[in-house]
Interface confidence: medium
Amino acid sequence: ASVVTELRCQCLQTLQGIHLKNIQSVNVRSPGPHCAQTEVIATLKNGKKACLNPASPMVQKIIEKILNKGSTN
């Protein structure tokens, strides 16, 4: 899923889910002056970034598991 780096929303596409084993960390960006949407940006173990759909139940479980592991940025 593509990520842009302007002062606006970063995610142009989102994935409904991704294998937890591929994720190194997750950054949950709350809505604010940069973007009026919650954005979930996963950094993968291969160094790439992927945007995940914050409304997806699978993504919510992933966030919960990673937060519990304490490996968020």
Partner: antibody, heavy 116, light 107 residues
């Protein structure tokens, strides 16, 4: 249950200013943002601006010079102030909450009429 | 500013028919499009967010789809209570903008 209620209705003379209060309950304005949107009679929706949990704001650039949004977290109230009103500012003014996405819940709106 | 263009401006349908409303963005807005229903003398109500996510309590006959610049709201079998104006809106960049709306009327 999230509820929003705008003060009003309001009659404003041309060139005068407008103040509306949005009272929120069921969620915290210290956690989520609150947007203001207006709708002229028989027309579509126009976004005015938003105040975020931390107090920062974004405005519609077309109206920014006339607009101010502020809040009082202790009273769970959000304020819209607009000056130099003209007849084409006559509209229904709504406040709406931010959640993960904007405009999740809306107030019932308040009619602002600009007339001499 | 991103311009959201809705079509048609109005449509007249019979109960049970399938309805497709279109919304086009003037530039790529990803999936940051929502759909709102506004009944006469009422506030707008969020129906679909993130292009395809149905809001809580919205009947499953309402489906949102699309990404980038082309978005669709489909009502699989229109009911009398669906008579309303429907607006799309983008939240990808400021200022947030809405389409001019589609009025859904019943025959």
């Amino acid at each position: 249950q999230v509820q929003l209620k705008e003060s009003g209705p309001v009659l404003v003379a041309p060139s005068q200013s407008l103040s509306i209060t949005c009272s929120v309950s069921g969620f915290s304005s210290t956690t989520y943002g609150v947007h203001w949107v207006r709708q002229p009679p028989g027309q579509g929706l126009e976004w005015l601006g938003v105040i975020w949990a931390g107090g920062s704001t974004n405005y519609n650039s077309a109206l920014m010079s006339r607009l101010s949004i502020s809040k009082d977290n202790s009273k769970s109230q959000v304020f819209l102030k607009m000056n130099s009103l003209q007849t084409d500012d006559t509209a229904m003014y709504y406040c709406a909450t931010q959640y993960h996405y904007p405009f999740a819940y809306w107030g019932q709106g308040t009619l602002v009429t600009v007339s001499a | 500013n991103i311009v959201m263009t809705q079509s048609p401006k109005s449509m007249s349908m019979s109960v049970g028919e399938r309805v497709t409303l279109s919304c086009k963005a003037s530039e790529n807005v990803g999936i940051y499009v929502s759909w709102y229903q506004q009944k006469p003398e009422q506030s707008p109500k969020l129906m679909i967010y993130g292009a395809s996510n149905r809001n809580t309590g919205v009947p499953d006959r309402f489906t949102g789809s699309g990404s980038a610049t082309d978005f669709t709201l489909t009502i699989s079998s229109v009911q009398a209570e669906d008579l309303a104006d429907y607006y799309c809106g983008q939240s990808y960049s400021y200022p947030l903008t809405f389409g001019a709306g589609t009025k859904l009327e019943l025959k």
